[in-house]
Amino acid sequence: GSERTCCPVNWVEHERSCYWFSRSGKAWADADNYCRLEDAHLVVVTSWEEQKFVQRHIGPVNTWMGLHDQNGPWKWVDGTDYETGFKNWRPEQPDDWYGHGLGGGEDCAHFTDDGRWNDDVCQRPYRWVCETELDKASQEPPLL
């Protein structure tokens, strides 16, 4: 495939990545699928600088990110190592509260109204952010 050298229309470029900010709300799995169909992934936050950038764009609304623990340990959707990576949880989060009886606890992470992270029931209809890296090979065939 060809390398992506500029961001798609309506995406925002920042530090060699492209970001798309939803306006509507979806469950985490639907948001994850939406990003994948755009040859992207739910946003993976790797630094305080990226955290601040995303926060500026989403405002005070719960917004899904690409972090979940649906299979056990917390994982970023692009494979970025969770344990050694950037974290910005609210105090006493993630609490993976099992009291809701959904089987797996609160398995999906989102930005809260102050930007810090919380884990919540993945079916909640929150906004989401897609991210794709510039210079990565796209799925599209090269133009001849």
């Epitope: 509507s24 709300g25 005070p60 919540d120 029931v121």
Partner: antibody
Amino acid sequence: QVQLVESGGGVVQPGRSLRLSCAASGFTFSTYGMHWVRQAPGKGLEWVAVIWYDGSNKNYADSVKGRFTISRDNSKNTLYLQMNSLRAEDTAVYYCARDQGVGYDGLDVWGQGTTVTVSS
Amino acid sequence: DIQMTQSPSSLSASVGDRVTITCRTSQGIGNYLAWFQQKPGKAPKSLLYKASSLQSGVPSKFSGSGSGTDFTLTISSLQPEDFATYYCQQYMTYPLTFGGGTKVEIK
């Protein structure tokens, strides 16, 4: 104090249209999601639609999808429900209600309701 | 859509009685459940949210519990003004859905 006042109800023939309004006061309207909920005579409550605080997200009950449109004018502190292709089963008291947050946090304050009767 | 089943659909009780109403959902909803009170000819009034959190101004005789699929509303000591119809509602996801209601009548 926080207040919601609905208007626009009345008697209308099947297939016709009606627009309901909900005037909000006593709170910062533009920071809250808003809902419409209805109640048919002698029946329980049925959620109709939601619109997020900034109008960016709208969701509808299947029973009204494609016929009803929820909207808001934050400059006028007013919520609307445009009802087209009305049916007899749309006969109900229509309440507007405030979301506790931007649009996904449940209902706290309700208006007094406005009655819509669809009859030939 | 998430189905909400309330029980009983009606009950008769006396002033001072402790009353419990249950609400069961067709799938887990966390604690995203609210309870409302409605009197004849009036708009519903919000009592509790997040299953157990009391709305501002609601007396502490009302309490809620539960999570997942099973929830209860309890009125610790029924007063004349509490005779009304009570509804549960889930707001975990759209469409929001209500229970069928429980009418609390005077015995």
